[in-house]
Interface confidence: medium
Amino acid sequence: AGVFELQIHSFGPGPGPGAPRSPCSARLPCRLFFRVCLKPGLSEEAAESPCALGAALSARGPVYTEQPGAPAPDLPLPDGLLQVPFRDAWPGTFSFIIETWREELGDQIGGPAWSLLARVAGRRRLAAGGPWARDIQRAGAWELRFSYRARCEPPAVGTACTRLCRPRSAPSRCGPGLRPCAPLEDECEAPLVCRAGCSPEHGFCEQPGECRCLEGWTGPLCTVPVSTSSCLSPRGPSSATTGCLVPGPGPCDGNPCANGGSCSETPRSFECTCPRGFYGLRCEVSGVTCADGPCFNGGLCVGGADPDSAYICHCPPGFQGSNCEKRVDRCSLQPCRNGGLCLDLGHALRCRCRAGFAGPRCEHDLDDCAGRACANGGTCVEGGGAHRCSCALGFGGRDCRERADPCAARPCAHGGRCYAHFSGLVCACAPGYMGARCEFPVHPDGASALPAAPPGLRPGDPQRYL
């Protein structure tokens, strides 16, 4: 058992152009909070899959109000760590999702109270009990800096929190077969709680609840001595029926040591000698350094000279993630203005501009009305890359050259007759109808039936925002 701890250092605009607008304003003050979701192994990072290792929500940060027009600075953060307790062994390899949420505090009634600002995800190797690992992740134009670690809750110790430690009973040394607990040298490694009744002299366990027998003993609780007179081999799993030691695999058979570790038998079990860059009971945990080349796609590795110090990958343009493992969809930042089409060519971004716009990011609005004339007193209106004429009354068409007949569209309902007028049109309604367009029937009692508002939503099942 233990606790995964996450410390958020900063959340703000990332480097480079296109700084995001502040999520808060004088009209809409807000505060941030964070959610972390952990999953064991290199599992799916999809936000919807369950947080099998656990999840945590931070406290709310201080209320923040941005000055109008100012770029977003690093935003004020909640106090304290995010802590995710884990009950079983720490897996060594895990996936994380960290979400930054905004809580709106403005005086508005509509809309949800919360909105997601950024979500980052990654996969990491981490030994419990190790130092804080630092990380930087980007989501769109935002950048999140954080540190994390896994620590065991006493009495558990070790890189997976599976070993147990107890205070020494004797002041000088630990009991037979028990090692001092590094780094707590004044404590001793305690035997795991084995299956009830497991012989303390002839049995042992590597997992809680099991009972494995030392050489020469057999039975479910290792209480039956093995008769070796009729046996050929001096070791192997015991046969409870014959009381004879049957040849079988030793603890190193099949090499339980991962990542090229070498196995050696011990009186109780086995021991792995791990190659450089790996540690743990079975060499399953990677202590990655820059020498191991952890940065992909041409990323530059900095720091991390030894397994106890974290490394940072500086990614080339177009890549992100702690190991530069993710290609950036640069078009997701919507760099092309005014409805331009974004093309990510790998080496560069290209914007294909709509008519009436130009520039590398379609930022220049061409003067649509230059050299254009609207007839009959019409005025030219720019917009959307094409000029448009706002025509004087009685004229229409692209350049206001056509005489407009306001009655051409038959605007009077229920058989009303239309008359062109200098101010537009007038409807003379048929008997039984009224209104500017003769749209309302007149009831015999003189009351008019006005149209009902469209029906609203009906309450239904739970709806999801995301």
């Epitope: 505090l105 949800p112 109270a113 709806q463 995301l466």
Partner: nanobody, 116 residues
Framework: QVQLVESGGGLVQPGGSLRLSCAAS????????VNWYRQAPGKEREKVAR????????NYANSAKGRFTISRDNSKNTLYLQMNSLRAEDTAVYYC?????????WGQGTLVTVSS
């Protein structure tokens, strides 16, 4: 399972008062923003009042300002709406709704009729 149950509706004369309650169960009520909505016959549903998860922030529609008060008791998982100076145009089915950043839930509604 998740439930929101409104109560306290009924017939009241213009100028009178009513207190609506909404009892929540099956989810972590204290982490949700909660709202009162209403829907009059033939009209769109409108949000009347909103209160943040901790109860520190309240918002009201213009039609409710100065007359309605929204409150909550997280220890009892209950939302309230105190309605004073009721008018005929307040006649509607009133719904409570709980919303958070990942989900939202609705009650079935309670009818408020303001008539002399």
């Amino acid at each position: 399972q998740v439930q929101l149950v409104e109560s306290g509706g009924g017939l009241v004369q213009p100028g009178g008062s009513l207190r609506l309650s909404c009892a929540a169960s099956g989810f972590d009520f204290s982490t949700y923003t909660v709202n009162w909505y209403r829907q009059a016959p033939g009209k769109e549903r409108e949000k009347v009042a909103r209160i943040s998860s901790t109860g520190t922030t309240t918002n009201y529609a213009n039609s409710a300002k100065g007359r309605f008060t929204i409150s909550r008791d997280n220890s009892k998982n209950t939302l309230y709406l105190q309605m004073n100076s009721l008018r005929a145009e307040d006649t509607a089915v009133y719904y409570c709704a709980a919303e958070r950043f990942d989900s939202n839930y609705w009650g079935q509604g309670t009818l408020v009729t303001v008539s002399s």
